[in-house]
């Protein structure tokens, strides 16, 4: 008789999840010499231990502490790029500008990027059928708690000038409910961070508006000000040209506004 299984509103665990995490870990540690000491089997065991046999609505940051410890990584604190609702461009940027890092350029971010996972209370099974949706089911699910934990730590580590890429095509350019708006912005440390510089990425080719004057950007400036951190904002009118100029900064067309 098949066991009754909780039906959640979100998609189930990504297929071949254990193999994917292990393979990504091996690949990452091969490419990044500073992480060669990491034992990927231990990393997977710690990852698995955070959610297996636990109710997928009762996950805590403490559950992920063993994984956080194994994945401890030092990135240059003044080279951090945060992003909100514009992941692809942010990743394209750090692929070119190799000395800057998004969360997904770190080991833990790389392991979990675009994956879903959850377990079941009191069984060692991974649930491939469904996992809790943040809105419809519960916020303390394995995926949300993971990203909240790593995002908080990433923001806490930042220093000097921190950059954030924001999507100017969205109705809320800065969204208080995004991971950036609800976690990262509140965990930048004023003793270390001098300025948050927002890059607002324009979508339309004919869009010449100053999106730095958008009301939601004023909300972001407000939160940052309350944290005793300076705020600045730049419009990126032509993201294609922006990336091109990062690749070839000496190009003559790269002196004008992007």
């Amino acid at each position: 008789v098949p066991r009754w299984r909780q039906q959640w509103s979100g998609p189930g665990t990504t297929k071949r999840f254990p193999e994917t995490v292990l393979a990504r870990c091996v690949k990452y540690t091969e490419i990044h010499p500073e992480m060669r000491h990491v034992d990927c089997q231990s990393v997977w065991d710690a990852f698995k231990g955070a959610f297996i046999s636990k109710h997928p609505c009762n996950i805590t940051e403490e559950d992920y502490q063993p994984l956080m410890k194994l994945g401890t990584q030092t990135v240059p604190c003044n080279k951090i790029l945060l992003w909100s609702r514009i992941k692809d461009l942010a990743h394209q940027f750090t692929q070119v500008q190799r000395d800057m890092f998004t969360l997904e350029d770190t080991l833990l971010g790389y392991l979990a990027d675009d994956l879903t996972w959850c377990g079941e209370f009191n069984t060692s099974k991974i649930n491939y059928q469904s996992c809790p949706d943040w809105r419809k089911d519960c916020s303390n699910n394995p995926v949300s708690v993971f990203w909240k934990t790593v995002s908080r730590r990433f923001a806490e580590a930042a220093c000097d000038v921190v950059h954030v890429m924001l999507n100017g095509s969205r109705s809320k350019i800065f969204d208080k409910n995004s991971t950036f708006g609800s976690v990262e912005v509140h965990n930048l440390q004023p003793e270390k961070v001098q300025t948050l510089e927002a890059w607002v990425i324009h979508g339309g080719r004919e869009d010449s508006r100053d999106l730095c004057q958008d009301p939601t950007i004023k909300e972001l400036e407000s939160i940052i000000s309350k944290r005793n951190i300076q705020f600045s904002c730049k419009n990126i009118y032509r993201p294609d040209k922006f990336l091109q100029c990062v690749k070839n900064p000496e190009d003559s067309s790269c002196t004008s506004e992007i």
């Epitope: 509140h186 003793e191 951190i229 300076q230």
Partner: antibody, heavy 123, light 107 residues
């Protein structure tokens, strides 16, 4: 305990300059931003802007750009408001107030205020 | 700039009565509204901060509610020490703006 102590009342003539001080104690001065608020007689409170106590960088509300200047003396845990070329309409009480943020709960509040400094501009 | 409209401008209440003050904002400010009490000759005192949070040491008879653009500040059982001006301040976006105040007197 946390205190913001402001300098005493000022009587000035139009065209003169005034510099008000706000000395903080009871907390780490450079951890929290300092706001300045104007209250003219019988009028609303008006937020003038804030001062980054780490960098000394000021941010002014549109109405207070030009003749107004915020500055800092970190070693003395003191913030300053200077008003140049005083006008009659600058007659008001000026308050300093810090922005507090809770590190554990994302809470923010303009919680502690100075006692206010009365500036009277009259010929 | 967010405009904050506060009413009533003045209020005369008997001791023991319930006091209600309202602020409307011209833009959606989530729950980033703060409420201050200012007695004559004193600086404003923060009673309630963002998220309708009662500040430490403030009596529980003070409370607030609201989200978006409509906010209400109430306190039960008015006392003589409550005679003061009351202000709402939005801290959602720069520049921070303040309501016109409510002067509370004893009837």
């Amino acid at each position: 305990q946390i205190q913001l102590v402001q300098s005493g009342p000022e009587l000035k003539k139009p065209g003169e300059t005034v510099k008000i001080s706000c000395k903080a104690s009871g907390y780490t001065f450079t951890n929290y931003g300092m706001n300045w608020v104007k209250q003219a007689p019988g009028e609303d409170l008006k937020w003038m802007g804030w001062l980054n106590t780490n960098t000394g960088e000021p941010t002014y509300a549109e109405e207070f750009k030009g003749r107004f200047a915020f500055s800092l003396e970190t070693s003395a845990s003191t913030a300053y408001l200077q008003i140049n070329n005083l006008r009659n309409e600058d007659t008001a009480t000026y308050f300093c107030a810090r922005w507090y943020y809770g590190s554990s709960d994302n809470s923010y509040a303009m919680d502690y205020w100075g006692q206010g400094t009365s500036v009277t501009v009259s010929s | 700039e967010t405009i904050v409209t506060q009413f009533p401008a003045s209020l005369s209440m008997a001791i023991g009565e319930k006091v209600t003050i309202r602020c409307i904002t011209s833009t959606d400010i989530d729950d980033d509204m703060n409420w201050y009490q200012q007695r004559p000759g004193e600086p404003p005192k923060l009673l309630i901060s963002e998220g309708n949070t009662l500040r430490p040491g403030v009596p529980s008879r003070f409370s607030s509610s609201g989200y978006g653009t409509d906010f209400v500040f109430t306190f039960e059982n008015m006392l003589s020490e409550d005679v003061a001006d009351y202000y709402c301040l939005q801290s959602d976006s720069l520049p921070y703006t303040v309501g016109g105040g409510t002067r509370l007197e004893i009837k």
